[in-house]
Interface confidence: low
């Protein structure tokens, strides 16, 4: 029988900067019942606080509700594991809520084949930001990524949409049934899960010649190719 092994706080996430949750991995239990407690203080404060809610986030978690969450305040936290033989502490983790946001997936994904008589056909994709994210005040800039593939294909085709909530795609296989999904991330946070897939049947007459394809990419601003330097800076996967 031994003191508990060292726990590790391995993840903290916030859906919207208003609340957040952290999770830890227990170390070895030393063969004895072990109690875990998370304590924290905020940068610039000396007063230590205990986790306000061990329930909401599930096992080995601490949830910080609205009244415990401050934007741009760094939280310094650690987990204490205790059994009859002694205690061990995790390393301190520094958490700034601004940088741990993982939003819910975008909503209301709609996909439509557009075939204007006088122009090139294209796939039109539209969606809405997740409801928990308050975009109006500008604290969030959400970036979006779309993926699509023919139903039976193995590989996804990925398009970065920047801050747009709609997107046009030109090059598709006629007659195929496509799966389309979208996800989002704040500029300093993590990608959401992919939205539920939407299916779209591409008509058999969805065709264009090479000349049309080149023209249409110009017409549409080259969305599939031209990513700004700022977008490239933010276009990383966590």
């Amino acid at each position: 029988q031994l003191p508990p092994g060292k726990p590790e706080i391995f993840k903290c996430r916030s859906p919207n900067k208003e609340t957040f949750t952290c999770w830890w991995r227990p170390g070895t239990d030393g063969g004895l019942p072990t109690n875990y407690s998370l304590t924290y203080h905020r940068e610039g404060e000396t007063l230590m606080h205990e986790c306000p809610d061990y329930i909401t986030g599930g096992p080995n978690s601490c949830h910080f509700g609205k009244q415990y969450t401050s934007m741009w305040r760094t939280y310094i936290m650690m987990v204490n594991a205790t059994n009859q033989m002694g205690s061990s502490f995790s390393d301190e983790l520094y958490v700034d809520v601004t940088y741990i946001v993982q939003p819910d997936p975008p909503l209301e994904l709609a996909v439509e084949v557009k075939q204007p008589e006088d122009r090139k056909p294209y796939l039109w994709i539209k969606w809405s930001p997740p409801t928990l994210i308050d975009l109006k005040t500008g604290w969030f800039t959400l970036l979006y990524e779309i993926r699509l593939k023919p139903e039976k294909a193995a590989e996804w085709e990925i398009h970065f949409a920047g801050q747009q909530t709609e997107f046009k795609i030109l090059s598709l296989h006629p007659g195929q049934k496509y799966l389309v999904q979208v996800r989002c991330k704040p500029d300093h946070g993590y990608w959401s899960a992919w939205s539920p897939a939407t299916f779209i049947q591409i008509p058999s007459d969805f065709t264009m010649n090479d000349e049309q394809k080149l023209i249409s990419e110009e017409d549409l601003g080259g969305e599939q190719k031209l990513i700004s330097e700022e977008d490239l800076h933010h276009h990383h996967h966590h």
Epitope: S70, M71, T98, K136, T137, G138, T141, Q163, E230
Partner: antibody
Amino acid sequence: EVQLVESGGGLAQPGGSLRLSCVASGFTFSTYWMSWVRQAPGKGLDWVGNIKQDGSEQNYVDSVRGRFTISRDNAKNSLFLQMNSLRAEDTGVYYCATLLTKGDYWGQGTLVTVSS
Amino acid sequence: DIQMTQSPSSLSASVGDSVTITCRASQDISNYLDWFQQKPGKAPKSLIYAASILQGGVPSRFSGSGYGTDFTLTISSLQPEDFATYYCRQYKTYPFTFGPGTKVDIK
């Protein structure tokens, strides 16, 4: 160092127009919302409106909506306030401000006087 | 619109005094609140953001607290350069709104 420099203020007739400019330096202008705030002589601060990073969205206080237009030119690090149908109550110092991650930065202001 | 009220509207104090200014929002604004200091003829200066976080370079005698609808700005030991007008502002919803200001002058 963050700097915001407003210009374009002056005397205008009621019903007239003015265009204010604000040139920014010391931060990546194109990645932040920008705001205009005004202050009538001897009075408090009033938020006028703001504009999204790419210029695609503007928000205004009701008293100026339909008369004032906020725009920006990210290539020139510039913010603009086009003021039409000016009224006496629009008189005051107009500040441009940026809501950076950690607080606001403000210009020195430019005075707008609406009088006949 | 969210209405912001401040009290007192003015106060007289001496150097070394502790001063507290209160700001109240007409509805819950979480911690989406700033405090500004403005001296005559100058632009406002950001002191505190997110209700309680001191802006870089602002002396530690300034502190902010509150959450929801009630907020306070405290100056623990008033210095000559602190005589000014102080404004709170909410940025929870549009339009952003300022309090009417509290003027702190020399007794």
